[in-house]
């Protein structure tokens, strides 16, 4: 069975048209959202930004893989984006949406 | 198709003896570490503590499941524990270790 690559950030451009949001989002047309994927396997090196709990969980998983899963690869740093959109009353609003862009990933 | 259990906290007691750490950790003998597991599937409800990015990623996954994974179930709140241990010079040290206990989980 194939070995998965280690937990890391992957590039992903999200088009608001693809999501069906083009009628209420004016700008941008899309954004670089990115995503996290990959294995959190022993040993968890420094690049994996692992928490102490993730290190403990990895060791427990090795002892007891049927009951305790590996930690998962998740965002450790997220950025906001500004979105220009129509609200329910057709007013044009500029709003900053938090935690929209993955900047870094780690084992959690 | 089988019903998936949603992302949530699961109880897990970790024994330092099982980890082979009994020779350097004096106290405690173990601790309630817990772990996160479960599905982050559409729709992500309020209990799932999902980030904006996780909501977007879930929608992209539905459109393109082969290339973009579902968000993963990871700790959203972690607590510290105090550990009494021997250092390399056999001194007894009391240290607070951050991010050791899972208090809450969410979709990331």
């Amino acid at each position: 069975s194939e070995l998965k690559t280690a937990c890391k950030k992957h590039e992903l451009y999200v088009s608001f048209q693809d999501l069906g949001w083009q009628d209420w989002i004016i700008a941008p047309k899309g954004y670089a959202a990115n995503y996290c994927d990959g294995e959190c396997s022993f040993p968890l090196n420094a690049h994996m930004n692992a928490t102490n709990h993730a290190i403990v969980q990895t060791l427990v998983h090795l002892m007891n893989p049927e009951y305790v899963p590996k930690p998962c690869c998740a965002p450790t740093k997220l950025n906001a984006i500004s979105v220009l959109y129509f609200d329910d009353n057709s007013n044009v609003i500029l709003k900053k949406y938090r935690n929209m862009v993955v900047r870094a990933c780690g084992c959690h | 198709s089988e019903l998936k259990t949603a992302c949530k906290k699961h109880e897990l007691y970790v024994s330092f003896q099982d980890l082979g750490w009994q020779d350097w950790i004096i106290a405690p003998k173990g601790y309630a570490a817990n772990y996160c597991d479960g599905e982050c599937s559409f729709p992500l409800n309020a209990h799932m503590n999902a980030t904006n990015h996780a909501i977007v990623q879930t929608l992209v996954h539905l459109m393109n499941p082969e290339y973009v994974p579902k968000p993963c179930c990871a700790p959203t709140k972690l607590n510290a524990i105090s550990v009494l241990y021997f250092d390399d010079n056999s001194n007894v040290i009391l240290k607070k270790y951050r991010n050791m206990v899972v208090r809450a989980c969410g979709c990331h």
Partner: antibody, heavy 121, light 112 residues
Framework: QVQLVESGGGLVKPGGSLRLSCAAS????????VHWVRQAPGKGLEWVGR??????????MYAAPVKGRFTISRDDSKNTLYLQMNSLKTEDTAVYYC????????????WGQGTLVTVSS | QSVLTQPPSVSGAPGQRVTISCTGS?????????VHWYQQLPGTAPKLLIY???ERPSGVPDRFSGSKSGTSASLAITGLQAEDEADYYC???????????FGGGTKLTVLG
């Protein structure tokens, strides 16, 4: 005491189907991960697949030779594990065991007595 | 062919010590996963003999011991007895998808 009892084995033609059952007693079945392991006549043990607990979404995993043909399920209310075998091949001939996974180190601490499946024309 | 490699057979006289090796790779034993050992007496189901590398379930004599180093594990049997004649299997996991892997089995013959 802990007991696992398999049933449903027998003679089946290639391409046919069979459903094996494994009745559990003497323990809280729903709290355990359970597996199917097989042993062809005169050969070694071969892992077939497993099903996790409700808390892990009853996730299943299968060995490559049976993937897409075999399906593992469980009914915790009946304390029973199942193995649905479709598109059977002669090389599936084996004694099929169900096995419970102990909860601290994941070893197979209890096994059924096995049920023989013979695939032959 | 099994993912974990065991010698097909070993033998020893009563009272002797024998060891059975189990060689894996960096994706299973070498990845840090636990190793378990099973004993299968003729015509019976396998029985857990050693779990978590070196722990014995209750009822297993201390003549049986297990160890692990790097990508290999081994089972040692001291004070060999006629009733130890059986097939022995090692088992671990493959790290890529946490699939169960077995060794091919070792037939232990007690001489005499």
């Amino acid at each position: 005491q802990v007991q696992l009892v398999e049933s449903g084995g027998g003679l089946v033609k290639p391409g046919g189907s069979l459903r094996l059952s494994c009745a559990a007693s003497g323990f809280t079945f729903s709290s355990y991960v359970v597996h199917w392991v097989r042993q062809a006549p005169g050969k070694g043990l071969e892992w077939v697949g497993r099903i996790k607990r409700e808390s892990s979404s009853y996730t299943t995993m299968y060995a490559a030779p049976v993937k897409g043909r075999f399906t593992i399920s469980r009914d915790d209310s009946k304390n029973t594990l199942y193995l649905q075998m479709n598109s059977l091949k002669t090389e599936d001939t084996a004694v099929y065991y169900c096995a419970r996974v102990e909860r601290s180190k994941s070893g197979f601490d209890n096994w059924g007595q096995g049920t023989l499946v013979t695939v032959s024309s | 062919q099994s993912v974990l490699t065991q010698p097909p057979s070993v033998s020893g006289a009563p009272g002797q010590r024998v060891t059975i090796s189990c060689t894996g790779s960096s994706s299973n034993i070498g990845a840090g996963y636990s190793v378990h050992w099973y004993q299968q007496l003729p015509g019976t189901a396998p029985k857990l003999l050693i779990y978590g590398q070196s722990e014995r379930p209750s009822g297993v004599p201390d003549r049986f011991s297990g160890s692990k180093s790097g990508t290999s594990a081994s089972l040692a049997i001291t004070g060999l007895q006629a009733e130890d004649e059986a097939d022995y299997y090692c088992q671990s996991w493959d790290s890529s998808q946490t699939l169960v892997v077995f060794g091919g089995g070792t037939k232990l013959t007690v001489l005499g």
